[in-house]
Amino acid sequence: EPPTACREKQYLINSQCCSLCQPGQKLVSDCTEFTETECLPCGESEFLDTWNRETHCHQHKYCDPNLGLRVQQKGTSETDTICTCEEGWHCTSEACESCVLHRSCSPGFGVKQIATGVSDTICEPCPVGFFSNVSSAFEKCHPWTSCETKDLVVQQAGTNKTDVVCGPQDRLRA
């Protein structure tokens, strides 16, 4: 009876279990009753990082110098190239597809430490009593306005992204 499932590192095709190609190799032809799976190594600038049945290898990532990228780790037949940014610049994401001078802290966050040539901007959430309503690479969280010192009262509470709104006190007539 033909199998319905195969072992690890195998795949089911034409009612039989064939070996997957190892990392760094692509599938040329499926196995038959009489022959093993045929695999071929990936080319110079290609890779496959898993046991697979792919008929094409993936191209290594290109670290585009026009985007400030350079090679951190050269790719192999089993691994992709890892890019990083030129000195003083910072990756926009984990995949490092482009570079920025420094990242900004979003509304609700303030700058804890300004970027240097070595480290990117460090942001911190605005605690209660403080806010930031801008994206910035230098502005800290600002304290809420003190309505009391202006002889006013809080009409709208502040948040981590907005200041309090002050208004006149309701004066009761005698």
Partner: nanobody
Framework: EVQLLESGGGLVQPGGSLRLSCAAS???????EMWWVRQAPGKGLERVS?????????YYADSVKGRFTISRDNSKNTLYLQMNSLRAEDTAVYYC?????????WGQGTLVTVSS
């Protein structure tokens, strides 16, 4: 396409002054935080000064505090850096940058040389 064109650099004696300008185009200048960044020969990038979109809040590196003044004219799409009491260690290429600054938006910079 973002374009930032720095100017105003040159050779100046220690204790002298210079005013750098940065003409911006290709984006809505008034909406962006702007920075001056410098690179001394053989050194890394140093963030010198920054200004918020409205021009009401500023940042200065400790090394230039009290000597440099950043300003902007949103009607002229221009950023400025007034540099007084210049020192030999201020010698660098000065770049202006918008936030966020992508590598490909980086200008050519203007060279400031402080020497007697």
């Amino acid at each position: 396409e973002v374009q930032l064109l720095e100017s105003g650099g040159g050779l100046v004696q220690p204790g002298g002054s210079l005013r750098l300008s940065c003409a911006a185009s290709g984006f809505t200048f008034r909406d962006y935080e702007m920075w001056w960044v410098r690179q001394a020969p053989g050194k890394g990038l140093e963030r010198v000064s920054a200004i918020n979109p409205q021009g009401t809040r500023t940042y200065y590196a400790d090394s230039v505090k009290g000597r440099f003044t950043i300003s902007r004219d949103n009607s002229k799409n221009t950023l400025y850096l007034q540099m007084n009491s210049l020192r030999a260690e201020d010698t660098a290429v000065y770049y202006c940058a918008k936030l966020p600054t992508l590598f490909q938006d980086w200008g050519q910079g203007t060279l400031v040389t402080v020497s007697s």
